[in-house]
């Protein structure tokens, strides 16, 4: 039985040219996280964080995506095209797969703020 829940940074905004942290957190389960996959709205893979094998960064993003913090992802040099949905897929044992959603809006405005519902140290 899957008892866990995924918390995410929810709907966030950041300014063009800036950076943003995409973060999910799995709670309420003792399941072991074996891998986290990060995908974009079109289901293209941004990155994989495997607990043992480390990080895979999709080549198209290698200059703009930084691993971490933690199981999260830092997306840099934002463009308007980065606006959209992002999904974190947690592969766990023995529970199975959990999925979280984040919506990122990239704003032209220099006063855009990146706000999150929670922070992970």
């Amino acid at each position: 039985m899957m008892t866990g829940t995924i918390e995410t940074t929810g709907n966030i905004s950041a300014k063009k040219g800036g950076s943003v942290i995409l973060q999910c957190h799995l709670s309420s389960t003792m399941a072991q996280v074996t891998q986290v996959n990060w995908e974009q709205h079109d289901h293209s893979l941004l990155a994989i964080r495997n607990a043992e094998l480390g990080w895979h960064i999709y080549p198209a993003f290698k200059d703009r995506v930084a691993p971490g913090p933690g199981l999260g992802l830092t997306l840099q040099s934002l463009t308007m095209n980065d606006t959209g949905e992002y999904f974190c897929t947690y592969h766990t044992y023995p529970d199975g797969t959990y999925r979280g959603r984040i919506f990122l809006e990239v704003l032209e405005s220099s006063v855009a703020e990146h706000s999150a519902r929670f922070q992970i140290p």
Partner: antibody, heavy 119, light 107 residues
Framework: EVQLVQSGAEVKKPGSSVKVSCKAS????????IHWVRQAPGQGLEWMGG????????IYNQIFRGRVTITADKSTSTAYMELSSLRSEDTAVYYC????????????WGQGTTVTVSS | DIQMTQSPSSLSASVGDRVTITCRAS??????VVWYQQKPGKAPKLLIY???YRFTGVPSRFSGSGSGTDFTLTISSLQPEDFATYYC?????????FGGGTKVEIK
């Protein structure tokens, strides 16, 4: 030049164990994961598992059900794969391969080690 | 586990031919697919990754495409040194799995 040099061919009895070595050179050993892949005669490729020399983490293909152990000696930049409880169907060529940095693709491979299991 | 199914399992072609090999995943693997080339008695060599980036030194006649579940390796003009077996592999989730291989033979 990146090189992975494996130990020589082995002939083993059913029920015994084999330990294959893979000596890496030409790069910083701790910066790249080492994988093991095998190929039975005339067959395709089968991923056995990987070892991260940076923190010592290992991951295994569960079809081997605890029969495989991957280790490394950082001081000699050598990775090892031990397979126990050998049976005839374990007869294969065993390859070590390096994963590219921040990429789950195996960019350099050892020459292969033939393991024959026969009574 | 994710199954990777390659087709055809073998094909005969002539030098200069355009060759297409397909690989289908049993479930979504996004763009987490790699292609290898293997010649008899030799270790596999990395050709294409993610799934359209050529590895260092791989000739431009090799190209890869696809996303989701369907992937293609294309050799635009087959050369004598291209006669080999080609494997796709997914790394979307562990265990990493390979296709059964496609043997490209001389017609």
């Amino acid at each position: 030049e990146v090189q992975l040099v494996q130990s020589g061919a082995e002939v083993k009895k059913p029920g015994s164990s084999v330990k294959v070595s893979c000596k890496a050179s030409g790069y910083t050993f701790t910066e790249h994961v080492i994988h093991w892949v095998r190929q039975a005669p005339g067959q395709g490729l089968e991923w056995m598992g990987g070892f991260n020399p940076n923190h010592g983490g290992t991951i295994y293909n569960q079809i081997f059900r605890g029969r495989v152990t991957i280790t490394a000696d950082k001081s000699t930049s050598t990775a090892y794969m031990e397979l126990s409880s050998l049976r005839s169907e374990d007869t294969a060529v065993y390859y070590c391969a390096r994963a590219a940095k921040l990429l789950f693709a195996m960019d350099y491979w050892g020459q292969g080690t033939t393991v024959t299991v026969s009574s | 586990d994710i199954q990777m199914t390659q087709s055809p399992s073998s094909l005969s072609a002539s030098v200069g031919d355009r060759v297409t090999i397909t690989c289908r995943a049993s479930q979504h693997v996004s763009n987490a697919v790699v292609w290898y080339q293997q010649k008899p008695g030799k270790a596999p060599k990395l050709l294409i990754y993610s799934p359209s980036y050529r590895f260092t030194g791989v000739p431009s006649r090799f190209s890869g495409s696809g996303s989701g579940t369907d992937f293609t390796l294309t050799i635009s003009s087959l050369q004598p040194e291209d006669f080999a077996t080609y494997y796709c592999q997914q790394h979307y989730s562990t265990p990493w799995t390979f296709g059964g291989g496609t043997k490209v033979e001389i017609k």
